[in-house]
Interface confidence: medium
C-alpha cells in the first residue's frame, strides 16, 4: 500500500474530523465521574476505576485494552495512630497539636477514605528538638544558613515552606544539613493569591488546607525496591535499607493555621532578608528554638506511617497502526490521586478519555492511524512515577526500538491564562504549526489562533513573535520515556500568568479541596480550556501517528544546543583563572555543536527532496528522526544518577521539577569554588565536557547520509 492508503480520507480531513469530535461537555462529564470519591494508588477504589476505564476504552473502539499490574512500595498513614506535630513544654506535656485532617469541603463531609495529609515514604519517628526556619529549604537557603549565618541545623527539626522546588529536594537538603525532622507548610505568600477567596468561595488555600506529596529522591529509579527492572511476580526485591531514594528522617506537612502556631514563637536570628519572609503574622525568625518566655518549649513530631508493597494497575489501550504498526506513539497520564484529584490528575484523565473516544469514533468509521497509538492510564504517579516507570522497564526493549514519541497528560490546567508547553526541541515546529491551526479560547482573542494568544501572553525570551517553550524536567510520567529511554516527549496544559501570580503551582494542589467544583466553578466553567488542551495533546498525537514524515525538525535541536553550550560556557567562565590553570576548554563541545548544526541542515534539505513514495527510503529517514533523541542517551547515565541518561537534559539536581541543560557539566561546575580538591573537581568538569561533546557529535552522525 502507498502511505496514504491506510487512511480513507485525506490527512487534513482526518485531523479535522478528530478535532471536531472532541467535546467540552464530554470532558466535563468525565471529570465529574472521575472525581466523586478518592482514587489513592493501591486502593480498591482506584482498581475499580482502572476496570471502568478499561471497559470504556473498549467500548470506545480500541483494538485491545489490558491491565498491567505491579507490586510496588507505597506508603500510608497508620489509621489508628495518626501523624501530628506538638509543641511540648519542659515537662514533656503537649501544649499544642497540629490538626489531624483537613476540614472537608462542602458536600464531601460524609466521604470515607480521605487520606489525611502526610508525606509519603516518611520513616516513622518521634524526634523532638528546637526548630530552625529554613525558608524554601533550597540549596541556596542552606548555603545562606550555614555559610553566611553560621546556623547549624544538626540535630534540629527544620520547618520549610512549600514552593519553588520539589519537596523531595527540600528533604534531601535538610538531611544533608543534619536535621532530624522536617515540617513542610504552605505559606500564604506562595499559596494565597491576592484578591481571590479561599475555597469554597474561591480557588485559594484555606488555613486548614494541606499539600500532600511524596518526598522521595528516586532519580528516575521507579519502585524503590526494584530499580531498573519491573516489580513483577518473580521480582527480586531489595531490603528496605537498600531501597532507592527513601528519606531517613521524619517529615510531615501542615497548613498555615498550624504553621502560624509554630512560627510565631520563633527566636534566634532574624530573617536574613525580605525573601525569607512570607505573609503570616510572624517575625520569620530563623531560630534555632523559641524566643524568651518560650525557650524551654520544644517541637515534637509523631510520625507512624508505614511502607507497604502494594499492587498497582496501569490501563494500556492499543489502536493498531495500519502502515507502521511497530512504531508507537504514546499518550499517557496518571489516574491515581491524593484525594479527589479535581485538577491533578483527573482534569488530564478526562481529556485523555475524550481523546480516546474521538479516535475510537474515527476507527469505527473505518479509519486507522498510520502508526500504532498506545494510550495509558498510569497508577501510582503520586508515589514516584511508579506505574509508568515499571511499565517502561518491563517493555524497555520494545520502546527503545519502536518508540516514536510520548505525550504526557497529567493536569490539563494549573490556571486559565495561557498555554504552557514543555517538550523536546524536535517537537517545536509541530507545536507551532498545530497551535496556528487551533482557535484561541482566550477572552479578547476571539477569531484568533491559539498560537497568537499564546505568543502574546507568553513570548519567547529569545525569538520575537514566537511563544515560550520550556525544557522538560521531571516530576511527571514522561520521565522514564525521555530521561531514561530517549523517546521524544512533550506536555501541554493551560497555566496561570506567571508575571502576576508568583505563588507555587496552584494553591489547592494536593489538598482535599481539589474537587470537581473547584474546576467547574472557578477555573473553567465552560471547559473551553480543557477542550483546547485536548486539541493540543490530541492534535500532537494525531500528527505524530499519522504524518507520512515524522513532524520532527532536527534543526531546532541545533539551535538549542548552541544556546546551551553558550550558557554552560559562561557559567564556567566565572572561574577564568581555574580554567587556565587546569586547561579547561569547551572547543570540543562547540565544534560538535557546529558539526551537528551543519549535518542537521543537510538532513533537513534531504528530507524536503527524497522520494516519499519509496517506503524503504521513507522508513529510513523516519528512523533517523525517531532515533535522534535516542542518540543523546549515554548508557552509563549521569554521575550517581544511572537512570538519568539523557546528556542534553536532566532534572535539576536541586529541583526535580526543573530541567537542566548539559546537566553533567552543570553539576560538575556547581559550587566548584567550595570543593576541597579543585584539581579533581576541574578534572570532572573536563570529563563532562568530553562526554557532552562526544554525545553531540555521535548524535550528529546519526543524521549523516547512511552511505
Amino acid at each position: 500500500k502507498s502511505s496514504n492508503e491506510a487512511t480513507n480520507i485525506t490527512p487534513k480531513h482526518n485531523m479535522k474530523a478528530f478535532l471536531d469530535e472532541l467535546k467540552a461537555e464530554n470532558i466535563k462529564k468525565f471529570l465529574y465521574n472521575f472525581t466523586q470519591i478518592p482514587h489513592l494508588a493501591g486502593t480498591e477504589q482506584n482498581f475499580q476505576l482502572a476496570k471502568q476505564i478499561q471497559s470504556q476504552w473498549k467500548e470506545f473502539g480500541l483494538d485491545s485494552v489490558e491491565l498491567a499490574h505491579y507490586d510496588v512500595l507505597l506508603s500510608y498513614p497508620n489509621k489508628t495512630h495518626p501523624n501530628y506535630i506538638s509543641i511540648i513544654n519542659e515537662d514533656g506535656n503537649e501544649i499544642f497539636n497540629t490538626s489531624l485532617f483537613e476540614p472537608p469541603p462542602p458536600g464531601y463531609e460524609n466521604v470515607s477514605d480521605i487520606v489525611p495529609p502526610f508525606s509519603a515514604f516518611s520513616p516513622q519517628g518521634m524526634p523532638e528538638g528546637d526548630l530552625v526556619y529554613v525558608n524554601y529549604a533550597r540549596t541556596e537557603d542552606f548555603f545562606k544558613l550555614e555559610r553566611d549565618m553560621k546556623i547549624n541545623c544538626s540535630g534540629k527539626i527544620v520547618i520549610a515552606r512549600y514552593g519553588k522546588v520539589f519537596r523531595g529536594n527540600k528533604v534531601k537538603n535538610a538531611q544533608l544539613a543534619g536535621a532530624k525532622g522536617v515540617i513542610l507548610y504552605s505559606d500564604p505568600a506562595d499559596y494565597f493569591a491576592p484578591g481571590v477567596k479561599s475555597y469554597p468561595d474561591g480557588w485559594n488555600l484555606p488555613g486548614g488546607g494541606v499539600q500532600r506529596g511524596n518526598i522521595l529522591n528516586l532519580n528516575g529509579a521507579g519502585d524503590p525496591l526494584t530499580p531498573g527492572y519491573p516489580a513483577n511476580e518473580y521480582a527480586y526485591r531489595r531490603g528496605i535499607a537498600e531501597a532507592v531514594g527513601l528519606p531517613s528522617i521524619p517529615v510531615h506537612p501542615i497548613g498555615y493555621y498550624d504553621a502560624q502556631k509554630l512560627l510565631e514563637k520563633m527566636g534566634g536570628s532574624a530573617p536574613p532578608d525580605s525573601s525569607w519572609r512570607g505573609s503570616l503574622k510572624v517575625p520569620y525568625n530563623v531560630g534555632p528554638g523559641f524566643t524568651g518566655n518560650f525557650s524551654t518549649q520544644k517541637v515534637k513530631m509523631h510520625i507512624h506511617s508505614t511502607n507497604e508493597v502494594t499492587r498497582i494497575y496501569n490501563v494500556i489501550g492499543t489502536l493498531r497502526g495500519a502502515v507502521e504498526p511497530d512504531r508507537y506513539v504514546i499518550l499517557g497520564g496518571h489516574r491515581d490521586s491524593w484525594v479527589f484529584g479535581g485538577i491533578d490528575p483527573q482534569s488530564g484523565a478526562a481529556v485523555v478519555h475524550e481523546i480516546v473516544r474521538s479516535f475510537g469514533t474515527l476507527k469505527k468509521e473505518g479509519w486507522r492511524p498510520r502508526r500504532t497509538i498506545l494510550f495509558a492510564s498510569w497508577d501510582a504517579e503520586e508515589f514516584g512515577l511508579l506505574g509508568s516507570t515499571e511499565w517502561a522497564e518491563e517493555n524497555s526493549r520494545l520502546l527503545q526500538e519502536r518508540g516514536v514519541a510520548y505525550i504526557n497528560a497529567d493536569s490539563s490546567i494549573e490556571g486559565n491564562y495561557t498555554l504552557r508547553v514543555d517538550c523536546t526541541p524536535l517537537m517545536y515546529s509541530l507545536v507551532h504549526n498545530l497551535t496556528k491551526e487551533l482557535k484561541s479560547p482566550d477572552e479578547g482573542f476571539e477569531g484568533k489562533s491559539l498560537y497568537e494568544s499564546w505568543t502574546k501572553k507568553s513570548p519567547s525570551p529569545e525569538f520575537s513573535g514566537m511563544p515560550r517553550i520550556s525544557k522538560l524536567g521531571s516530576g511527571n510520567d514522561f520521565e522514564v520515556f525521555f530521561q531514561r529511554l530517549g523517546i521524544a516527549s512533550g506536555r501541554a496544559r493551560y497555566t496561570k500568568n506567571w508575571e502576576t501570580n508568583k505563588f507555587s503551582g496552584y494553591p489547592l494542589y494536593h489538598s482535599v479541596y481539589e474537587t470537581y467544583e473547584l474546576v467547574e466553578k472557578f477555573y473553567d466553567p465552560m471547559f473551553k480550556y480543557h477542550l483546547t488542551v485536548a486539541q493540543v495533546r490530541g492534535g500532537m498525537v494525531f500528527e505524530l501517528a499519522n504524518s507520512i514524515v515524522l513532524p520532527f525538525d532536527c534543526r531546532d535541536y541545533a539551535v538549542v544546543l548552541r544556546k546551551y553550550a553558550d550558557k554552560i560556557y559562561s557559567i564556567s567562565m566565572k572561574h577564568p583563572q581555574e580554567m587556565k590553570t587546569y586547561s579547561v576548554s569547551f572547543d570540543s563541545l562547540f565544534s560538535a555543536v557546529k558539526n551537528f548544526t551543519e549535518i542537521a541542515s543537510k538532513f533537513s534539505e534531504r528530507l524536503q527532496d527524497f522520494d516519499k513514495s519509496n517506503p524503504i527510503v521513507l522508513r529510513m529517514m523516519n528512523d533517523q528522526l525517531m532515533f535522534l533523541e535516542r542518540a543523546f542517551i549515554d548508557p552509563l547515565g549521569l554521575p550517581d544518577r544511572p537512570f538519568y541518561r539523557h546528556v542534553i537534559y536532566a532534572p535539576s539536581s536541586h529541583n526535580k521539577y526543573a530541567g537542566e541543560s548539559f546537566p553533567g557539566i552543570y553539576d560538575a561546575l556547581f559550587d566548584i569554588e567550595s570543593k576541597v580538591d579543585p584539581s579533581k573537581a576541574w578534572g570532572e568538569v573536563k570529563r563532562q565536557i568530553y562526554v557532552a561533546a562526544f554525545t553531540v557529535q555521535a548524535a550528529a552522525e546519526t543524521l549523516s547520509e547512511v552511505a
Epitope: 490538626s99 489531624l100 485532617f101 483537613e102 476540614p103 472537608p104 463531609e109 500564604p188 494565597f192 491576592p194 484578591g195 481571590v196 477567596k197 479561599s198 475555597y199 469554597p200 468561595d201 474561591g202 485559594n204 484555606p206 488555613g207 486548614g208 498555615y256 493555621y257 505573609s279 503570616l280 503574622k281
Partner: antibody, heavy 122, light 111 residues
Framework: EVQLQQSGPELVKPGASVKISCKAS????????MNWVKQRPGQGLEWIGR????????NYNGKFKGKATLTADKSSSTAYMQLSSLTSVDSAVYFC???????????????WGQGTSVTVSS | DIVMTQSPASLAVSLGQRATISCRAS??????????MHWYQQKPGQPPKLLIY???NLESGVPARFSGSGSGTDFTLNIHPVEEEDAATYYC?????????FGGGTKLEIK
C-alpha cells in the same frame, strides 16, 4: 502595620440615609473580607454583613437586608456602609473589621476600626 | 442562625485569681477537628480586640494568661492570673456559617 480608619460621627434625621467609610492600609485590601458590626449603647455586638473588595461579593445578616448596603473602592482601599431609612433603633456605633488570611470562611476578625457613632434624632 | 449564649453575664474576680467565661452554641461549630469559635475583649470606648481564634489559638501579642478551650457546642475562655488591665467585656463569636453571631458578652470586674 494594618490600620482601619473610620469616618467621623454622624447626626442624622429619621428617614434619612448615611454613608460611613473605613479606609484600610498596611495590607492587601482586596484580598480580605471586610465585616461591619453594630453596637448599640450598652449592648452587645451584632454582625451586619461583609464584602470582598476584589469582586464586590457581599453577604448580609438577614436582619440588615434592605437597611445596610456594603460597597468598596479598591483604588482608595476604602469600604463603605450606607444605612437607609434611619430610625432611632439605628443609633449605634458601627465598626468595620477585617478578616484574617482565610478570607473569612473560617476565620476571625483580627483588626477593627475605631468605630463610627451614628445618632438618629430629629 | 446559630445562637451563642454566654455565661455569666458578669463576674468579679480577685487580682491574681482565675476568671472562667463560658459560651454555648445552639449547634456544633466544630468540624474535622477545627472549632470555628473566637474570643474578643472590649474596653469602654474602644473597638473589640481579638484574643483567641479557632477556639484555642492565641492571637499574636496577646498575653499567655489568656487561653481558650472546648469543641462542639461548649467553649471556655480562661484568664489566669487575672490582672487589673483585664477589666473589660468579653465576647465569643462563631464563624462556622453565615450569619456570624456573637454571644451577649460577659463583663469582668476586678475585685
Amino acid at each position: 502595620e494594618v490600620q482601619l480608619q473610620q469616618s467621623g460621627p454622624e447626626l442624622v434625621k429619621p428617614g434619612a440615609s448615611v454613608k460611613i467609610s473605613c479606609k484600610a492600609s498596611g495590607y492587601a485590601f482586596s484580598s480580605s473580607w471586610m465585616n461591619w458590626v453594630k453596637q448599640r449603647p450598652g449592648q452587645g455586638l451584632e454582625w451586619i454583613g461583609r464584602i470582598y473588595p476584589a469582586d464586590g461579593d457581599t453577604n448580609y445578616n438577614g436582619k440588615f437586608k434592605g437597611k445596610a448596603t456594603l460597597t468598596a473602592d479598591k483604588s482608595s482601599s476604602t469600604a463603605y456602609m450606607q444605612l437607609s431609612s434611619l430610625t432611632s433603633v439605628d443609633s449605634a456605633v458601627y465598626f468595620c473589621a477585617r478578616c484574617g488570611w482565610d478570607g473569612g470562611v473560617y476565620y476571625a476578625m483580627d483588626y477593627w476600626g475605631q468605630g463610627t457613632s451614628v445618632t438618629v434624632s430629629s | 442562625d446559630i445562637v451563642m449564649t454566654q455565661s455569666p453575664a458578669s463576674l468579679a474576680v480577685s487580682l491574681g485569681q482565675r476568671a472562667t467565661i463560658s459560651c454555648r452554641a445552639s449547634k456544633s461549630v466544630t468540624t474535622s477537628g477545627y472549632s470555628y469559635m473566637h474570643w474578643y475583649q472590649q474596653k469602654p470606648g474602644q473597638p473589640p480586640k481579638l484574643l483567641i481564634y479557632l477556639a484555642s489559638n492565641l492571637e499574636s501579642g496577646v498575653p499567655a494568661r489568656f487561653s481558650g478551650s472546648g469543641s462542639g457546642t461548649d467553649f471556655t475562655l480562661n484568664i489566669h492570673p487575672v490582672e487589673e488591665e483585664d477589666a473589660a467585656t468579653y465576647y465569643c463569636q462563631h464563624s462556622r456559617e453565615l450569619p456570624r453571631t456573637f454571644g451577649g458578652g460577659t463583663k469582668l470586674e476586678i475585685k
